[in-house]
Interface confidence: medium
């Protein structure tokens, strides 16, 4: 089941999955003056069994300007150096995605991908927040949140994530108004059915995880 | 790539409704792409931000000037972003653009208010609010 709503925004903070749950899909999108190969899969999918999960389908971009020619899969160095490099609070490795079961890695990238990665995320997916640099993390609770399946409808739990300025006093809640703002985001529970696939895996695994998992940006 | 396709524009009298829509079309879903509303008023060189909307519509965001008066919503299984501008004013008068924006599913900023930010764009559709 796809999660049709956004994770929620948290201001001055970004968030990032560490794993893909089976279902993920994951556009093959190019770069400018490229485009995906006519024969070529418009998503990625992460698929698998019970011990293996990988993603299916490849994604392969060609020049605009060429009819035939494909482009190899494998990156250029030259084309991983154009991405961006994040500054976050104390960076570290991210925990072993593998390790964790029905769930695929972070894809490589492939020659000439767009710059930015597009993904469809599926019921019981996690991602982790982290305050952009020159904030710090007041924390509330979990600075993660999992798209759960309630009343029939996908939503987002929300993390209790604040970030704050260096040199500012401490905010709280309801004091910083985001640029964009929920629109109606429940952040409490109910007594109907409420499905968290692997849930407690993932809870976990975020147990042995700092708040600062982020080292590259598609963006 | 996308193809947007405005329809909706027209002439109204100060204080009417109008609704604009965007219909895309191409290989991608529609849910990839966050989605917003320029306008570019006769004279003027820059497009105007009016608004834009999240890929799920979770998030909204307006420009100060329209505010209050006029609400972008879509619909992904019609692949739809709509426009509706209540309470018209003559200073709303101007080509109004769709335009189309990816973002990461790992990195993002939920809605772009910038046109730089924007990889795609319609053709444009009409509005006059006369007085």
């Known amino acids: 089941e796809l999660c049709d709503d956004d994770p929620p925004e948290i201001p001055h903070a970004t968030f990032k999955a560490m794993a893909y749950k089976e279902g993920t899909m994951l556009n093959c999108e190019c770069k400018r003056g490229f485009r995906r190969i006519k024969s070529g899969s418009l998503y990625m999918l992460c698929t698998g069994n019970s011990s293996h999960s990988s993603w299916d389908n490849q994604c392969q971009c060609t020049s605009s300007a060429t009819r035939n020619t494909t482009k190899q899969v494998t990156p250029q160095p030259e084309e991983q150096k154009e991405r961006k490099t994040t500054e976050m609070q104390s960076p570290m490795q991210p925990v072993d995605q593998a390790s964790l079961p029905g769930h695929c890695r972070e894809p490589p990238p492939w020659e000439n991908e767009a710059t930015e990665r597009i993904y469809h995320f599926v019921v019981g997916q996690m991602v982790y927040y982290q305050c952009v640099q020159g904030y710090r993390a007041l924390h509330r609770g979990p600075a993660e949140s999992v798209c759960k399946m309630t009343h029939g409808k996908t939503r987002w739990t929300q993390p209790q994530l604040i970030c704050t300025g260096e040199m500012e006093t401490s905010q709280f809640p309801g004091e910083e108004k985001p640029q964009a703002s929920p629109e109606g985001r429940p952040e409490s529970e109910t007594s109907c059915l409420v499905t968290t696939t692997d849930f407690q895996i993932q809870t976990e695994m975020a147990a042995t995880m700092e708040t600062s998992i982020f080292t590259t940006e598609y963006q | 790539e996308v193809q947007l396709v405005e329809s909706g524009g027209g002439s109204v009298q100060a204080g009417g409704s109008l609704r604009l829509s965007c219909e895309a079309s191409?290989?991608?879903?529609?849910?990839?792409?966050?989605m917003g509303w320029f306008r570019q008023a006769p004279g003027k060189k820059e497009r105007e931000f009016v608004g834009a909307i999240s890929r799920y519509g979770t998030y909204t965001s307006y420009a100060d000037p329209v505010k209050d008066r006029f609400t972008i919503s879509r619909d992904n299984a019609k692949s739809t972003v709509y426009l509706q501008m209540n309470n018209t004013k003559p200073e709303d008068t101007a080509v109004y653009y769709c335009?189309?924006?990816?973002?990461?599913?790992?990195?993002?900023?939920?809605?772009?208010?910038?046109?730089?930010?924007?990889?795609?764009w319609g053709q444009g559709t009409q509005v006059t609010v006369s007085s």
């Open positions: 335009a189309a924006y990816t973002y990461s599913g790992s990195f993002y900023s939920t809605v772009k208010t910038h046109h730089d930010e924007y990889h795609y």
């Open positions: 191409g290989p991608t879903l529609f849910s990839s792409y966050g």
